[in-house]
């Protein structure tokens, strides 16, 4: 008789999830000599231990602590780039500007990027059929808790000037409910972080509005100022040109505003 299985509203665990996490770990430690000491088998065991045999709506940050410990990594605290709803451009930027780091440029962020996972209470099985959706099912699911945990730690580590890339094409350029708005903003340490600089990325080619005046950006400025952190904002009118100029800063067209 087939065992009854909980049907969740979200997609199931990414296929070949264990193999993918292990492969990414091996690759990351090969590319980054400073992480060469990491034992990828132990990393996978700790990752698995965070959610296997546990109810996927009852995951805590504590569950991920063994993994956090194994994945401890020092990134230059003044070279951190946060992002919200504009991941691809943020990653393209750090691929070119190699001395800056998004969360997904760290080992733990890289391992989990674009993956979904969950288990089932009291069985050692991974659920490849469905996983809880943050809105429709529960917020304390394995994926959401993981990103909340690593995002908090990443923000806590930041210092000096912290940059954040925001999507100017969205109705809420700054969204209080995003990971950036609900976790990272509140975990920047005022005693370490001097300024949060927002880069608002324009979508339309003819869009010359000053999106730094958007009400949601003003809301972000208010939250940040109340935390005794300075705030600054820049419009990136031409993201394609912006990336090109990061690649080739000497280009004559890169002196004008982008």
């Amino acid at each position: 008789v087939p065992r009854w299985r909980q049907q969740w509203s979200g997609p199931g665990t990414t296929k070949r999830f264990p193999e993918t996490v292990l492969a990414r770990c091996v690759k990351y430690t090969e590319i980054h000599p400073e992480m060469r000491h990491v034992d990828c088998q132990s990393v996978w065991d700790a990752f698995k231990g965070a959610f296997i045999s546990k109810h996927p709506c009852n995951i805590t940050e504590e569950d991920y602590q063994p993994l956090m410990k194994l994945g401890t990594q020092t990134v230059p605290c003044n070279k951190i780039l946060l992002w919200s709803r504009i991941k691809d451009l943020a990653h393209q930027f750090t691929q070119v500007q190699r001395d800056m780091f998004t969360l997904e440029d760290t080992l733990l962020g890289y391992l989990a990027d674009d993956l979904t996972w969950c288990g089932e209470f009291n069985t050692s099985k991974i659920n490849y059929q469905s996983c809880p959706d943050w809105r429709k099912d529960c917020s304390n699911n394995p994926v959401s808790v993981f990103w909340k945990t690593v995002s908090r730690r990443f923000a806590e580590a930041a210092c000096d000037v912290v940059h954040v890339m925001l999507n100017g094409s969205r109705s809420k350029i700054f969204d209080k409910n995003s990971t950036f708005g609900s976790v990272e903003v509140h975990n920047l340490q005022p005693e370490k972080v001097q300024t949060l600089e927002a880069w608002v990325i324009h979508g339309g080619r003819e869009d010359s509005r000053d999106l730094c005046q958007d009400p949601t950006i003003k809301e972000l400025e208010s939250i940040i100022s109340k935390r005794n952190i300075q705030f600054s904002c820049k419009n990136i009118y031409r993201p394609d040109k912006f990336l090109q100029c990061v690649k080739n800063p000497e280009d004559s067209s890169c002196t004008s505003e982008i």
């Epitope: 070949r16 492969a23 091996v26 590319i31 000491h37 990491v38 034992d39 990828c40």
Partner: antibody
Framework: EVQLQQSGAEFVRPGASVKLSCTAS????????MHWVKQRPEQGLEWIGW????????KYAPKFQDEATLTADTSSNTAYLHLSSLTSEDTAIYYC??????????WGQGTLVTVSA | DIVMTQSPSSLSVSAGEKVTMSCKSS????????????LAWYQQKPGQPPKLLIY???TRESGVPDRFTGSGSGTDFTLTISSVQAEDLAVYYC?????????FGGGTKLEIK
């Protein structure tokens, strides 16, 4: 099951070039580095380098920096080794390989390249 | 580059005998971060690609018979076959898995009498 399937043997003239392929199955090459290793007849193994198919970043052994070019096509899950200006010294079996945990755990079957006039 | 030196270059033994082969590296393969040695051993049979036997100097790859044992630390490593079988006829290579460029030893050819 992880497999690396390499292209067939090549017989080429000195000065010519050749492009060898390695098609992966059982994993996404974007999640791994794809390595290449050279083995001349009756000789040992030499690491050529790796490519990261995710961003086309490469790393070569100094000896092969100017001799070999590594590329990849993520849409076909295939890595390539391009060898140009071939000489008899390039007559060898070329393997693609993938590291797992530590060491090269997966190897292609090898492609024999023979350079002869 | 780290130079890997294997000895002997060849040896001939009877089935059932114990075999040891040596691998020396020009620099330490010990990772100071985790105190593990980054050395691998491979077996290559005629007409086949190499097969990973041992990684981390002493950890057997899954499916490798327990007659194969790796030992050593720093710059001196040994592969031992406790009781050689006919199917162990092959060339055995050690590899620096510690730093770029990865380098291999010249190999030890094992022949069965």
């Amino acid at each position: 099951e992880v497999q690396l399937q390499q292209s067939g043997a090549e017989f080429v003239r000195p000065g010519a070039s050749v492009k060898l392929s390695c098609t992966a199955s059982g994993f996404n090459i974007k999640d791994s580095l794809m390595h290449w290793v050279k083995q001349r007849p009756e000789q040992g193994l030499e690491w050529i380098g790796w490519i990261d198919p995710e961003d086309d970043k490469t790393k070569y052994a100094p000896k092969f920096q100017d001799e070999a070019t590594l590329t990849a096509d993520t849409s076909s899950n295939t890595a390539y080794l391009h060898l140009s200006s071939l000489t008899s010294e390039d007559t060898a079996i070329y393997y693609c390989a993938r590291r797992f945990l530590r060491g090269f755990a997966y190897w292609g079957q090898g492609t024999l390249v023979t350079v002869s006039a | 580059d780290i130079v890997m030196t294997q000895s002997p270059s060849s040896l001939s033994v009877s089935a059932g005998e114990k075999v040891t082969m040596s691998c020396k590296s020009s620099q330490s393969l010990l990772n100071s971060g985790n105190q593990k040695n980054y050395l691998a051993w491979y077996q290559q049979k005629p007409g086949q690609p190499p097969k990973l036997l041992i990684y981390g100097a002493s950890t057997r790859e899954s499916g490798v018979p327990d007659r194969f044992t790796g030992s050593g630390s720093g710059t001196d490593f040994t592969l031992t076959i406790s009781s050689v079988q006919a199917e162990d006829l092959a060339v055995y290579y050690c590899q620096n898995d510690h730093s770029y460029p990865y380098t291999f030893g010249g190999g030890t050819k094992l022949e069965i009498k």
